[in-house]
């Protein structure tokens, strides 16, 4: 299978992990499908819930993946950006804060560029409740870890804030920051930001990004 | 720094093929982004007309669908735009553009300087 | 597909004064619009993107606002060199479609 939507439609519907394989090619990667949400179908690519995973990992942990698909994990750079040049992906995003409310953002066109190209971020026609104006700067952005500084500020982002993520100088988001627990989790600059929904000093309490191919 | 060179006749019959290249230097056209054709009629009014995106697929305007075709050369860095079945109507200047998307339509960063085409007998 | 109505057609006005140029789209294209600046003799040159974002090197005199169905390109203070055609464009669906243009002249 090569993401979440050809696991169900072969008749897998029930969540759980799945081994997808990468487009033209026998390597393989385990991957959490969601068969339930919004018709199923979704690829899980990050996921963050309860601190358990460490984020602020190198260039090539953020390429091919780290963590436990089950829990916290990032699916992978390489596999993500082969698997969305291929045909067109829809990106969503969703966000759940520490006083019980969810809400998430929309991408109707999304795609890695390759890892010459710093895995890029391009996005398009956002919708949703998580803001009216996109938390990933757009145009899009390289792609930033600890050992890898790609962003648009002469600081380090990716030191600054932690985790690997797009930043731009630093920009709005990051997903893949700190996690901070209930009551640590204001004025915390560094931690799981969705600007445009929560604020710059509010870390998140649970984010998961997840992609389905746009004519699923 | 990206450039976008476009050329080709500048008087072309009608019933005829038109023919354009976009030379592109600063930035290979197999990397990323959409690569597109545009035309400006007399008046100024813009058309969108359609792109070739970095991984080889092609979008068209609806309203030239049957008549347009654009391709590629990635050895020369160009991509080509051809215009069949031409009339008046299509004289115009046409800008080749890079857009800032590869696999959709979007805002354009980088145009050429544009060629003018007249379709006359 | 989206009709962008762009107006008005004709500014004229003196240098240092404050000018704005609406788009209507006829359906929604979300933020998905760009401005664009036409000088005489040349090629259009991205202003303002996604509705808002000024891109690399453009004057902060430039400034973009809207979403859904309305936007509005403003010039705060204009300049002579400012002499061009000012076009929207959206770009939220397939085709992307053009204003009609606003001509700015200066007195």
């Known amino acids: 299978f090569r993401d979440c939507a050809e696991v169900f439609k072969s008749g897998h519907t029930t969540n759980g992990i799945y081994t997808l394989t990468f487009p033209n090619s026998t390597e393989e990667i385990k991957a959490y499908c969601d068969m339930e949400a919004g018709g199923g179908g979704w690829t899980i690519i990050q996921r963050r819930e309860d601190g358990s995973v460490d984020f602020q990992r190198t260039w090539k942990e953020y390429k091919v993946g780290f963590g436990n698909p089950s829990g916290e994990y990032w699916l992978g750079n390489e596999f993500v950006s082969q698997l969305t040049n291929q045909q067109r992906y829809v990106l969503k995003i969703h966000l759940k804060d520490w006083e019980g409310n969810e809400a998430y953002s929309l991408y109707e066109h999304f795609y890695l560029s390759s890892e010459e190209l710093n895995y890029r971020i391009h996005l398009k026609g956002l919708t949703g409740t998580a803001g009216k104006i996109s938390s990933i700067s757009q145009p899009g952005n390289d792609f930033s870890t600890k050992d890898g500084d790609n962003d648009k500020c002469i600081c380090k982002c990716s030191q600054m804030l932690t985790g690997g993520w797009w930043f731009d100088a630093c920009g709005p988001s990051n997903l893949n920051g700190m996690y901070y627990p209930q009551r640590q989790n204001t004025n915390a600059f560094n931690g799981i930001k969705w600007y445009y929904w929560k604020g710059s000093g509010y870390s998140l309490k649970a984010t998961t990004m997840m992609i389905r191919p746009a004519d699923f | 720094d990206v450039q976008l060179q476009e050329s080709g006749p500048g008087l072309v019959k009608p019933s005829q093929s038109l023919s354009l290249t976009c030379t592109v230097t600063?930035?290979?056209?197999?990397?990323?982004?959409?690569w597109n054709w545009i035309r400006q009629f007399p008046g100024n009014k813009l058309e969108w007309m359609g792109y070739?995106?970095?991984?080889?697929?092609?979008s068209y305007n609806p309203s030239l669908k049957s008549r347009i075709s654009i391709t590629r050369d990635t050895s020369k860095n160009q991509f080509f735009l051809q215009l069949n079945s031409v009339t008046p109507e299509d004289t115009a200047t046409y800008y080749c553009a890079r857009s800032t998307f590869g696999h959709y339509v979007s805002s354009m960063d980088y145009w050429g300087q544009g060629t003018s085409v007249t379709v006359s007998s | 597909s989206i009709v962008m109505t762009q107006t008005p057609k004709l500014l004229l006005v003196s240098a240092g004064d404050r000018v704005t140029i609406t788009c209507k789209a006829s359906q929604s294209a979300s933020n998905d619009v760009a401005w664009y600046q036409q000088k005489p003799g040349q090629s259009p040159k991205l202003l303002i993107y996604y509705a808002s974002n000024r891109y690399t090197g453009v004057p902060d005199r430039f400034t973009g606002s809207g979403y859904g169905t309305d936007f509005t390109f403003a010039i705060s203070t204009v300049q002579a060199e400012d002499l061009a055609i000012y076009f929207c464009?959206?770009?939220?669906?397939?085709?992307?479609?053009f204003g009609g243009g606003t001509k700015l002249e200066i007195k």
């Open positions: 600063g930035y290979s056209i197999t990397s990323d982004y959409a």
């Open positions: 464009q959206q770009d939220y669906s397939s085709p992307p479609t």
């Open positions: 070739i995106s970095y991984s080889g697929s092609t």
